[in-house]
């Protein structure tokens, strides 16, 4: 059974992941930078189901494409270089989903733009956090 300390750690990691994803979304949605519409050509794959931490496998598999699309953005939109930002997210995702069991991600048929993709994972983080608090 999860201890209160492990639950607290999980919550903090999810909050960190949530902040990172929100920072990216804010950076690309910035009304002062509509030139980033070029990012809308990139296609992202969404999870069929995302209700448990193991489903973060689906996010992990999309981190490389996420880094590629962020490379189109000017670095001033983010505090960190895309590579460092994605590396940070990857570390959190790996810790959260665990590596004991291998989970095969199932993707939905419909693809998503970067905005839809980020919103989906932001909602996921918020949902899991709410069950922990």
């Amino acid at each position: 059974a999860p201890t209160s300390s492990s639950t607290k750690k999980t919550q903090l990691q999810l909050e960190h992941l949530l902040l990172d994803l929100q920072m990216i979304l804010n950076g690309i949605n910035n009304y002062k930078n509509p030139k980033l519409t070029r990012m809308l050509t990139f296609k992202f794959y969404m999870p069929k189901k995302a209700t448990e931490l193991k489903h973060l496998q689906c996010l992990e598999e999309e981190l490389k494409p996420l880094e590629e699309v962020l490379n189109l953005a000017q670095s001033k939109n983010f505090h960190l270089r895309p590579r460092d930002l994605i590396s940070n997210i990857n570390v959190i995702v790996l810790e959260l989903k665990g590596s004991e069991t291998t989970f095969m991600c199932e993707y939905a048929d419909e693809t998503a733009t970067i905005v839809e993709f980020l919103n989906r994972w932001i909602t996921f983080c918020q949902s899991i956090i709410s069950t922990l608090t």
Epitope: T37, K43, T111, T113
Partner: antibody
């Protein structure tokens, strides 16, 4: 009404220079990428390049890099396509188009009427 | 340089279904856009982001994508659909864009 109005048809001699224009109206010209597209007679569409009038960042097709220059003057909501030395092979219809954002994603949702360029000695 | 390949022509009888394909290595990760160009006119966007239809475009136009192939479908083709159709997308870097080779649709 959102529209792009292009300059009129041009007839030039090989080696001459040329600058054609594309004026936007009915929207915030600064905030949308403008693309240029070539169509030779009876042929398909060819992407030449794009410009973001807000800061004049450009991207060129490798096929057109060094052959043409794309520029914009946001103060008069106008984008330009220019040649320093025309060739007979530059004879074509040239379209400007706005990359949408919003409802059309990256799709080019508004097009100019086209400018015919004829280069002949 | 990056290429998008389309069949040169597709013929269809009025009321029948026309399918136009567009093949490109980057399409699993990049959206396809479709343009209709009628003779002597500027192109018109008919499908964006693989399958979304702009307002004002008839429901008979639909799009899909699977792997390296995007498809434009005209269900119940009409005489006024006779035109050239071009797919449009970007290379893997997202920095350079390209039109497909174009497909002439004839409604016999």
């Amino acid at each position: 009404e959102v529209q792009l109005v292009q300059s009129g048809a041009e007839v030039k001699k090989p080696g001459e220079s040329l600058k054609i224009s594309c004026k936007g109206s009915g929207y915030n010209f600064t905030n949308y990428w403008i693309g240029w597209v070539r169509q030779m007679s009876g042929k398909g569409l060819e992407w030449m390049g794009i410009i973001y009038p807000g800061d004049s960042e450009t991207r060129y097709s490798p096929s057109f890099q060094g052959q043409v220059t794309i520029s914009a003057d946001k103060s008069i909501s106008t984008a330009y396509l220019q040649w320093s030395s025309l060739k007979a092979s530059d004879t074509a219809m040239y379209y400007c188009a706005r990359h949408g954002g919003g409802w059309s994603g990256w799709g080019m949702d508004v097009w100019g009427q086209g400018t015919t360029v004829t280069v002949s000695s | 340089s990056y290429e998008l390949t389309q069949p040169p022509s597709v013929s269809v009888s009025p009321g029948q279904t026309a399918r136009i394909t567009c093949s490109g290595d980057a399409l699993p990760r990049k959206y396809a856009y479709w343009y209709q160009q009628k003779s002597g006119q500027a192109p018109v966007l008919v499908i964006y982001e693989d399958s979304k239809r702009p307002s004002g475009i008839p429901e008979r136009f639909s799009g899909s994508s699977s792997g390296t192939m995007a498809t434009l479908t005209i269900s119940g083709a009409q005489v006024e659909d006779e035109a050239d159709y071009y797919c449009y997308s970007t290379d893997s870097s997202g920095n350079h864009y390209v039109f497909g080779t174009g497909t002439k649709v004839t409604v016999l």
